[in-house]
Interface confidence: low
């Protein structure tokens, strides 16, 4: 007769059997995995009983377990099946960073060894393109990219090992809106150690700009954070006689638009 | 990047000891099962001992049970391996093994051989 | 335990030329239990494929795994110089692991 696995879990599975017909006094239960060999259920269940549960497991791990029904000393041909304890999921799934058309998120690994997680990102609210990433197993976190502006997306993060696939981790996050970059954008003034720029803006609500002069010397960038309301700025502290490729963007909260890129070169002393 | 790096192999009289040691880096080492491998000069590869992360589960091939014993410091990403009553066909280079699952190895150091001499 | 026999013992082909390696296990082994490494003179072993048919991180796609039950086999579909080294096939499906014998990939 058939022995069924009735639940499964990280750490332990329960069996159930049909009871064989005539006399049973108890019956031998063992198991075996490939990492621990083989154990007996102790104390053996007797002969009423059709389940067991066997526990301490490891996880994540494929277990034999084989039922033999005694009766003073005869012993019947033994049951036997394979089941695999479940996987751990992972946990404290976090979004470290969300635009407009791009998430990041980080979670903490199952205490098993795996061979890989699957991130599932599925818009929530409207009809668009489910994505699907395999990670290493040695994974942490993930940038999708890709995504659609101002959604809603369901993200979970399931742990593999071998055919095995953990409940998932999961949460839920909006992609931003998307910002328009600036418009325009051209030099108005040089000096020896300024440059001037100017721009406008399409009409959205937005709540700053940043612009970053990178020299084309390789010495370090600028970096400037300029109020909603400016059109006009002037970034100093520039050296004499050098070429700057000069980054604008837009800012609308955690937020920013792609670069408009201005070259410029300071007057020379 | 993932580096494993093994100490403590030298030339040992038969019944002597050794302890050989694997520093551990580029990875978190303490979840993760450890193994040492071997293969003698010239032969193929043979499987030694394994220990769990927390280093409550230790395994031992037939052949050094008893003998041998594998050991972890997880302060210090390190890994060990103690040999006692060691015998001239424990003469090998001895490889420290980053585990995936307990038998899978995906990173080895780069060995240390211990030979076993009169 | 579980032995492996891997066949050829030695392989002599030239670069460009597929070489097919077998490996048979005593007792059927789950091909979630099967892992392949190749080893260089005087290098550790490299782990190549594992669960009979999956690459490990880095491994170039002419490196293929195949088989079940007791016989698996480990393709190179186009010989590169750096492959030719030793194969070795494992198993880790029973206690303790076991590696095949090796096989040796030389030039010709």
């Known amino acids: 007769k058939g022995l069924a696995f009735t639940d499964v879990d990280v750490d332990s599975i329960k069996i159930a059997w049909e009871s064989p017909q005539g006399q049973v006094s108890r019956y031998r239960v063992t198991y075996s995995s490939p990492e621990d060999g083989i154990h007996e259920l102790f104390p053996a269940p007797d002969g009423e009983e059709d389940t067991a549960e066997l526990q301490g497991l490891r996880p994540g791990s494929e277990y034999t377990v084989s039922v033999v029904a005694l009766h003073d000393d005869m012993e019947s041909q033994p049951l036997i099946g394979t089941q695999s304890t479940a996987i751990p999921a992972p946990t404290d799934l976090k979004f470290t960073q969300v635009t407009p058309t791009s998430l990041s998120a980080q979670w903490t690994p199952p205490n098993v060894q795996l061979t890989g997680y699957r991130v599932r990102v599925t818009p929530k609210e409207k009809t668009g393109p489910m994505k699907e990433i395999n990670l290493a197993p040695d994974s942490s976190s993930v940038v999708v990219s890709g995504l659609m502006v101002a959604t809603k997306y369901e993200v979970s993060v399931y742990a593999l090992k071998d055919t095995l696939t953990s409940r998932p981790a999961q949460g839920v996050v909006t992609t931003l809106e998307n910002v328009s970059p600036p418009r325009r954008a051209r030099v108005t003034d040089a000096t020896e150690t300024t440059i001037t720029i100017s721009w406008r803006t399409k009409t959205e609500t937005i709540t700053g700009f940043q612009v970053d002069a990178v020299p084309a010397n390789g010495q370090t960038p600028i970096q400037r954070t300029i109020k909603p309301d400016v059109r006009s700025y002037t970034i100093t502290g520039l050296q004499p006689g050098t070429d700057y490729k000069i980054y604008l963007y837009t800012l609308n909260d955690n937020a920013r638009s792609s670069p408009v890129v201005i070259d410029a070169s300071t007057a020379i002393d | 990047e993932v580096q494993l790096v093994e100490s403590g192999g030298g030339l040992v009289q038969p019944g002597g000891s050794l302890r050989l040691s694997c520093a551990a880096s580029?990875?978190?080492?303490?979840?993760?099962?450890m193994s040492w491998v071997r293969q003698a000069p010239g032969k193929g590869l043979e499987w030694v001992s394994a220990i769990s992360g927390s280093g409550g589960s230790t395994y031992y091939a037939d052949s050094v049970k008893g003998r041998f014993t594998i050991s972890r410091d997880n302060s210090k990403n390190t890994l060990y391996l103690q040999m006692n009553s060691l015998r001239a066909e424990d003469t090998a280079v001895y490889y420290c093994?980053?585990?995936?699952?307990?038998?899978?190895?995906?990173?080895w150091g780069q060995g240390t051989l211990v030979t076993v001499s009169s | 335990e579980i032995v492996l026999t891997q066949s050829p013992g030695t392989l002599s082909l030239s670069p460009g030329e597929k070489a097919t390696l077998s490996c048979r296990a005593s007792q059927s082994v789950s091909l979630h239990f099967l892992a392949w490494y190749q080893q260089k003179p005087g290098q550790a072993p490299r782990l190549l494929i594992y669960?009979?048919?999956s690459r490990a991180t880095g491994i170039p796609d002419r490196f293929s795994g195949s088989g079940s039950g007791t016989d698996f086999t480990l393709t190179i579909s186009r010989l590169e110089p750096e492959d030719f080294a030793v194969y070795y096939c494992?198993?880790?499906?029973?206690?303790?692991?076991?590696f095949g014998q090796g096989t040796k990939v030389e030039i010709k």
């Open positions: 669960g009979a048919s």
């Open positions: 093994a980053k585990s995936t699952h307990l038998y899978l190895f995906d990173y």
């Open positions: 580029g990875f978190t080492f303490s979840p993760i099962t």
């Open positions: 494992q198993q880790m499906r029973g206690r303790p692991p076991t």
